[in-house]
Amino acid sequence: LTCLGGFASPGPVPPSTALRELIEELVNITQNQKAPLCNGSMVWSINLTAGMYCAALESLINVSGCSAIEKTQRMLSGFCPHKVSAGQFSSLHVRDTKIEVAQFVKDLLLHLKKLFREGQFN
């Protein structure tokens, strides 16, 4: 069961539903972006492979004071089996490459859409 708490989900939902809603939230962010997202903050790039949800959260959690991605952070925490806190890094980060949050979101969105189309929900 995927359980995304807080403002994200009313309770446990199927993995496909959770992924669908995460994709829609990322679409929301990209569509509604006017000024530079999170004031142009930079985050570590990640390898979009197994364990990427935790890696994505570890990267984005270091961005503070950016309301636009708070819901995404909460939703990603529902996909990550362990608690993630700022300053925590896994081997999935490409530690020599930082990119803007806006680009990070676009890359993540493209990859998640591909997974969704291919039926890879877990």
Epitope: P10, V13, S16, T17, R20, E21, Q31, G119, F121
Partner: antibody, heavy 118, light 107 residues
Framework: EVQLQESGPGLVKPSETLSLTCTVS????????WNWIRQPPGKGLEYIGY???????YYNPSLKSRVTISRDTSKNQFSLKLSSVTAADTAVYYC????????????WGQGTTVTVSS | DIQMTQSPSSLSASVGDRVTITCHAS??????LSWYQQKPGKAPKLLIY???DLHTGVPSRFSGSGSGTDFTLTISSLQPEDFATYYC?????????FGGGTKVEIK
């Protein structure tokens, strides 16, 4: 109360494109997920795909190469186009709503019958 | 795709009978199963979601159970308006798929 109403031609020639529209009243297509489902005569239900409140789409891989779902927010409508139709596409076509964070269809249109024949 | 198999495909019953319909999923779908009722010439209507949760306005004679791969829809005391075809649907993964239907006829 949200209501859905399908409309479109009841007869389409083989190899042509089937075009249907679903009009949503009592709610906005800028929330939730808006789906198409079909039912061939005397058979079960087949999921076609959705368009989301953001305009994002998903299509059943079995039909993906032929399907387009689009929307017109100013008219509160969403549409289905199915190209290169054959007799196997003859069915009752339903539009249905799926609310955010859910995976079941709680509101359906009454359905419209489309026959593919020359 | 996840295949949904319903049994029986049809059954005959009398008013007041207890009726049971089963739905089998080709893989584990946890509790992500819904049931619909369809009458001739009408759209399906949602009865049950999450395997056992009754949709708003659905009479309590309808109940659902099961998890994993095997599910059951039960009508405790069949009423004249219950003669219809019933479909199950999985929400575990896209594309969503439906069972082939069970037609409940008057004996």
């Amino acid at each position: 109360e949200v209501q859905l109403q399908e409309s479109g031609p009841g007869l389409v020639k083989p190899s042509e494109t089937l075009s249907l529209t679903c009009t949503v009243s009592g709610g906005s297509i800028s929330s939730d997920y808006w789906n198409w489902i079909r039912q061939p005569p005397g058979k079960g239900l087949e999921y076609i795909g959705y368009i989301s409140y953001n305009g994002n789409t998903y299509y059943n891989p079995s039909l993906k190469s032929r399907v387009t779902i689009s929307r017109d927010t100013s008219k509160n409508q969403f549409s289905l186009k199915l190209s290169s139709v054959t007799a196997a596409d003859t069915a009752v076509y339903y539009c249905a709503r799926l609310a955010k964070w859910t995976w079941y269809f709680d509101i359906w249109g009454q359905g419209t019958t489309v026959t593919v024949s020359s | 795709d996840i295949q949904m198999t319903q049994s029986p495909s049809s059954l005959s019953a009398s008013v007041g009978d207890r009726v049971t319909i089963t739905c089998h999923a080709s893989q584990n779908i946890n509790v992500w199963l819904s049931w619909y009722q369809q009458k001739p010439g009408k759209a399906p209507k949602l009865l049950i979601y999450k395997a056992s949760d009754l949709h708003t306005g659905v009479p309590s004679r309808f109940s659902g159970s099961g998890s994993g791969t095997d599910f059951t829809l039960t009508i405790s005391s069949l009423q004249p308006e219950d003669f219809a075809t019933y479909y199950c649907q999985q929400g575990q993964s896209y594309p969503y798929t439906f069972g082939g239907g069970t037609k409940v006829e008057i004996k």
